[in-house]
């Protein structure tokens, strides 16, 4: 029960996180005009990964897309790439984790396969979350650098007569959404990895006892069942391992659905 809950919660947390990463990537407010200690402007500038916007005091908002690829700063391209990789990995992770959920039965999928899928999706969520956190952090670092550079020459004199006010940008809402979303995706991934450990089938400790009739090489088992050391039809005698490695020709003994909670 605890494993199912951990897996389910991990899935939900990751789902929220990835939705947040998508939202952050699409948001326009990655950087917003710094209003503190600046001349009061009748416009409010803010920028996203894909376009920059200006809201005028009348409420009219105008956005312009970045219609160039080569002309954009390498850092911005890197942030875009990180966020997209995060979204793609997260989306694939979600798809994999849906089939890995213990509460969902798909044909005769074994628990070992579900465990592997849970681990895979968990790792994908962790990488996805790290990509988002890295992307947002790179952008934030870029903002901090530019902020202090523009503060150093807040007013750039033009011939000593006319002054141009430098528009300083500070952290926008998308950065906080991205950090939180990346963190949630990361946590969800860790939960999936933890759930995977509980899902992985452990070795059965059942010791099959062979009874050898004198003068016969046939193993006898009461109750009219076929002579066997396990549940299969293999009649070979095998060395019994207590939770150790199996011999190559041993038939896999799958636990029943009642073996794990």
């Amino acid at each position: 029960m605890a494993v199912t809950a951990c897996q389910g919660l991990g899935f939900v947390v990751s789902l929220i996180g990835i939705a947040g990463i998508i939202a952050a990537t699409c948001m326009d407010q990655w950087s917003t005009q710094d209003l503190y200690n600046n001349p009061v402007t009748a416009v409010f500038n803010y920028q996203g990964l894909w376009r920059s916007c200006v809201r005028e005091s009348s409420g009219f908002t105008e956005c312009r897309g970045y219609f160039t690829l080569l002309g954009l700063p390498a850092m911005l391209q890197a942030v875009r790439a990180l966020m997209i990789v995060g979204i793609v990995l997260g989306a694939i992770g979600l798809l994999v984790s849906i089939f890995a959920l213990k509460c969902i039965r798909i044909g005769s999928m074994e628990d070992s396969a579900k465990a592997n899928m849970t681990l895979t999706s968990g790792i994908m969520f962790i990488v996805s979350g790290l990509c988002a956190i890295a992307g947002v952090s790179v952008f934030a670092n870029m903002l901090v650098t530019n902020f202090w550079m523009s503060t150093a020459n807040m007013y750039t004199g033009m011939g000593g007569m006319v002054q141009t006010v430098q528009t300083r940008y500070t952290f926008g809402a998308a950065l906080f959404v991205g950090w939180v979303a990346g963190g949630l995706t990361l946590i969800g991934g860790v939960m999936m990895c933890i759930a995977c450990r509980g899902l992985a089938p452990e070795e059965t400790n059942y010791k099959a006892v062979s009874y050898h009739a004198s003068g016969h090489s046939v193993a006898y088992k009461p109750g009219g069942f076929k002579a066997s050391t396990g549940f299969g039809s293999n009649t070979k005698n095998k060395k019994i391992y207590d939770g150790g490695a199996r011999t190559e020709d041993e038939v896999q003994s799958y636990p029943s659905k009642h073996d794990y909670v």
């Epitope: 005009q33 001349p39 009061v40 402007t41 009748a42 416009v43 500038n45 803010y46 920028q47 920059s52 916007c53 200006v54 005028e56 005091s57 009348s58 409420g59 009219f60 105008e62 312009r64 006319v162 002054q163 141009t164 006010v165 528009t167």
Partner: antibody, heavy 120, light 113 residues
Framework: EVQLVESGGGLVQPGGSLRLSCAAS????????MHWVRQAPGKGLEWVAY????????YYVDKLKGRFTVSRDNAKNSLYLQMNSLRAEDTAVYYC?????????????WGQGTLVTVSS | DIVMTQSPDSLAVSLGERATINCKSS????????????LAWYQQKPGQPPKLLIY???TRESGVPDRFSGSGSGTDFTLTISSLQAEDVAVYFC?????????FGGGTKVEIK
Amino acid sequence: EVQLVESGGGLVQPGGSLRLSCAASGFTFSSFGMHWVRQAPGKGLEWVAYISSGSSPIYYVDKLKGRFTVSRDNAKNSLYLQMNSLRAEDTAVYYCARAGYAVRNALDYWGQGTLVTVSS
Amino acid sequence: DIVMTQSPDSLAVSLGERATINCKSSQSLLNVGNQKNYLAWYQQKPGQPPKLLIYGASTRESGVPDRFSGSGSGTDFTLTISSLQAEDVAVYFCQNDLFYPLTFGGGTKVEIK
């Protein structure tokens, strides 16, 4: 048709108070920011104050802060300018003007103005 | 505050001739966010309120004759009346629309020579 009609002007003694009103019609008043601009006789235009559609933010010209207060009542389609501690230099025609939408913050419609005379 | 300096103070032009008014701001009115200039031009005839002619430095307000045109960027702007008509006799003001307080130029009086 957009119409802005100012009222409340008149003769007032120095140190006195006056409340100007601007009645708006022909547009959705609650969706637009509004300005007060004044013009002393024979002089140029001087921007006084701005109030956004939702009454926040409000901006004033520094020298009038504390003496002048702008407000609005969207339910009554009205804009107000409360002027206290009036001085002779406040004598002017006071215009209310609409902050145009998609016109780069320009003032697209103006009222006819109301004359305020501060004299003893 | 942004200082708007208009020149000349007055201008006498013959009917049908070109009239040019200049406006200079103490700070750039070009907003880097959208690369637009926030400067407006107004016309005020005697006994009337001002009327918006040009916004964004170069965009004519609807209903304004095409003989009026605006140009310039950053700190230097120009209003041009390509062929002066009798009804164009008025005072013309430029206005900073980017920074509060919004400031006006001193005005240029256009008359017929």
